[in-house]
C-alpha cells in the first residue's frame, strides 16, 4: 500500500464514554490535523475509513458496521455508538484517503462504568462559581448533536446520588442548573441525565461536572504582603543564618497569574553572587484564595549582606505591591571584663 501520513496515536484526545450510552466521536483529523473539513474532503473524492485495535491486542481490524440495530455506524466524520459496550474500549483510527492521498490518526477510546451515584474513572470538568455573586448557571455539557431540535429530551439533575428538585438555592431549568446564591455547601459533583427517544428506543446521556465555589471578584483585592512588615526586624550577627519569609495573600481571580519574588539590592537573587536559596510553599482557602510563602535563606550571612536591601514583590491581575524587610547587624553585647572595666576607668 502507498505511503500514508500517520499522525500516530493522539493521546491528547483520551476520549472517555459511559458504558451503555450513546457516543458520537468526531474524527480528529478535521479538528486538529488537517486544514480542511470533512465536506471539502468528501467533495474532493476522499473517503473516510474507520478501524480499531481492541484493548490489549495488536491487531488492527475493521469496525463491524453490520451489528444488530446498527449499534455502531458512521455518519459523515462521526463514529456513532448506539449504545457503547464495555469491550468497545480500544484505539480507533480514522483514515482519509483516495488513490493519491492518505492521512490517518489514531485515538484511544475508553468505555467506563459508573456507579449508582455517577462515580466513575471519568475525568470531570470543573466549573467555578463565584461565592454569593447572584444567579449563575451551569449547562449540561457535550450533548449537542445527539438528537434533532425537534426532539424534546427530559433532563434530570443530581448532586451525587440525589435528584435536585424544589431546592431554594439550586434550581433545575432544563439543560441549565441555576445557583441563586452559590455557597461553599454547593461544592460537589453535579450530574445531568438527558433522556431522549430514537427509533422506538430510549437513550440516556450522563454528564457529570465538579462545581467549585470560589472567591468573588466583588471581594478581590490586590496582593497583601503579611510578611515582611514593619514590626519584625531581622537582626543577625555575621556567620548566622538569615531567614526572611515573604508571605502574600492573593484573592481568587479567574485565570490570574499570582507571582511572588525577592529582589536583593534591586536584582533578582539569580543575578547576584551571594549564596541565597529561596523555598516556596502555597496554600489555598476553601474559596481558592491563595497564600504564597517564599523563604529567602542565606546560610552564613556576612556583614555586607546585612547592609543590603531585601524586598519582597507580589503581583496579580489586581496589581503589584512590594515590601522591604528590616535587616540589620546585631550590635555585639559588651564583654564585661574589657569594655565595662574600661568604662569604669580601670587601667
Amino acid at each position: 500500500s502507498e505511503r500514508c501520513d500517520d499522525w500516530g496515536l493522539d493521546t491528547m484526545r483520551q476520549i472517555q464514554v459511559f458504558e451503555d450510552e450513546p457516543a458520537r466521536i468526531k474524527c480528529p483529523l478535521f479538528e486538529h490535523f488537517l486544514k480542511f473539513n470533512y465536506s471539502t474532503a468528501h467533495s474532493a473524492g476522499l473517503t473516510l475509513i474507520w478501524y480499531w485495535t481492541r484493548q490489549d491486542r495488536d491487531l488492527e481490524e475493521p469496525i463491524n458496521f453490520r451489528l444488530p440495530e446498527n449499534r455502531i455506524s458512521k455518519e459523515k466524520d462521526v463514529l456513532w455508538f448506539r449504545p457503547t459496550l464495555l469491550n468497545d474500549t480500544g484505539n480507533y483510527t480514522c483514515m482519509l484517503r483516495n488513490t493519491t492521498y492518505c492521512s490517518k490518526v489514531a485515538f484511544p477510546l475508553e468505555v467506563v462504568q459508573k456507579d449508582s451515584c455517577f462515580n466513575s474513572p471519568m475525568k470531570l470538568p470543573v466549573h467555578k462559581l463565584y461565592i454569593e455573586y447572584g444567579i449563575q448557571r451551569i449547562t449540561c455539557p457535550n450533548v449537542d448533536g445527539y438528537f434533532p431540535s425537534s426532539v424534546k429530551p427530559t433532563i434530570t439533575w443530581y448532586m451525587g446520588c440525589y435528584k435536585i428538585q424544589n431546592f431554594n438555592n439550586v434550581i433545575p431549568e432544563g439543560m441549565n442548573l441555576s445557583f441563586l446564591i452559590a455557597l461553599i455547601s454547593n461544592n460537589g459533583n453535579y450530574t445531568c441525565v438527558v433522556t431522549y427517544p430514537e427509533n422506538g428506543r430510549t437513550f440516556h446521556l450522563t454528564r457529570t461536572l465538579t462545581v467549585k465555589v470560589v472567591g468573588s471578584p466583588k471581594n478581590a483585592v490586590p496582593p497583601v504582603i503579611h510578611s515582611p512588615n514593619d514590626h519584625v526586624v531581622y537582626e543577625k550577627e555575621p556567620g548566622e543564618e538569615l531567614l526572611i519569609p515573604c508571605t502574600v495573600y492573593f484573592s481568587f481571580l479567574m485565570d490570574s497569574r499570582n507571582e511572588v519574588w525577592w529582589t536583593i539590592d534591586g536584582k533578582k537573587p539569580d543575578d547576584i553572587t551571594i549564596d541565597v536559596t529561596i523555598n516556596e510553599s502555597i496554600s489555598h482557602s476553601r474559596t481558592e484564595d491563595e497564600t504564597r510563602t517564599q523563604i529567602l535563606s542565606i546560610k552564613k550571612v556576612t556583614s555586607e549582606d546585612l547592609k543590603r536591601s531585601y524586598v519582597c514583590h507580589a503581583r496579580s491581575a489586581k496589581g503589584e505591591v512590594a515590601k522591604a524587610a528590616k535587616v540589620k547587624q546585631k550590635v555585639p553585647a559588651p564583654r564585661y571584663t574589657v569594655e565595662l572595666a574600661c568604662g569604669f576607668g580601670a587601667t
Partner: antibody, heavy 119, light 107 residues
C-alpha cells in the same frame, strides 16, 4: 469525631407507624447524605433508602417505596425514617449511616434502634 | 436487583491464620463494592471501599481485591478481635444490596 445518635427502642402494633430519628454531630450535616439500613433478628443487612441532607430528596429501595418516608432537618442535623403499615416481619434493628452525597459506602453508623412489631 | 452471594457461610479458623472471604455478584459491579465487619450487638463498621481501599483506621491485615463479579476480603493473620460477621455491599445499581454475610468464628 462524627457521631450518629438514634432514638430509643419502640414497640408497635401491626398496621401502625414508627418514626426513628438520627442526630448527627461532629461534621457538616449538609455535606452528607444519610441512609437507613435494617437488620431483622439473626439476618443480614437490607438497605431501605437514603436522603441528601442539603436537598432533602430521597432514594428508596423499590421494596419499601410507598411505605417508608425519609426526611432530614438541616437546622437540627437530624434525619428521620418513618415506616408505615407495620407488620411483624418489620421487627428489626434500624440503623442510620452516613455517606458522601456521591458516596456508595457507609462510613459512619448509628448505634441502631430496635423496632418490635407485635400485637 | 443485584444479588451478592458470600461464601463460605461460616469460616472456622484459629488466631494467626489467614482468612479468605468471597463475594460474588449476579452481574458486574465493576469495583463499586465495600466490605463491613459486624460484631454481636454492634453496628457494622466499614473496612474496605472501592473493592480494595482500606477505610480510615483499618489495620493493614485487612485487604480487598477483585473487580466485576468476583471479590475477596483477606485477613492476613487473624487477631482475636477479628472474629465477627463480614458483609459485602454493592453500589453499582439501585437498590444497594448486601451479601448474606460470612461468619468468621474461632475454631
Amino acid at each position: 469525631q462524627v457521631q450518629l445518635v438514634q432514638s430509643g427502642a419502640e414497640v408497635k402494633k401491626p398496621g401502625s407507624s414508627v418514626k426513628v430519628s438520627c442526630k448527627a454531630s461532629g461534621g457538616t450535616f449538609s455535606s452528607y447524605a444519610i441512609s437507613w439500613v435494617r437488620q431483622a433478628p439473626g439476618q443480614g443487612l437490607e438497605w431501605m433508602g437514603g436522603i441528601s441532607a442539603i436537598f432533602g430528596t430521597a432514594n428508596y429501595a423499590q421494596k419499601f417505596q410507598g411505605r417508608v418516608t425519609i426526611t432530614a432537618d438541616e437546622s437540627t442535623s437530624t434525619a428521620y425514617m418513618e415506616l408505615s403499615s407495620l407488620r411483624s416481619e418489620d421487627t428489626a434493628v434500624y440503623y442510620c449511616a452516613r455517606h458522601l452525597h456521591n458516596g456508595i459506602h457507609l462510613d459512619y453508623w448509628g448505634q441502631g434502634t430496635l423496632v418490635t412489631v407485635s400485637s | 436487583e443485584i444479588v451478592l452471594t458470600q461464601s463460605p457461610a461460616t469460616l472456622s479458623l484459629s488466631p494467626g491464620e489467614r482468612a479468605t472471604l468471597s463475594c460474588r455478584a449476579s452481574q458486574s459491579v465493576s469495583n463499586f463494592l465495600a466490605w463491613y465487619q459486624q460484631k454481636p450487638g454492634q453496628a457494622p463498621r466499614l473496612l474496605i471501599y472501592g473493592a480494595s481501599n482500606r477505610a480510615t483506621g483499618i489495620p493493614a491485615r485487612f485487604s480487598g481485591s477483585g473487580s466485576g463479579t468476583d471479590f475477596t476480603l483477606t485477613i492476613s493473620s487473624l487477631e482475636p478481635e477479628d472474629f465477627a460477621v463480614y458483609y459485602c455491599q454493592q453500589g453499582k445499581h439501585w437498590p444497594w444490596t448486601f451479601g448474606q454475610g460470612t461468619k468468621v468464628e474461632i475454631k
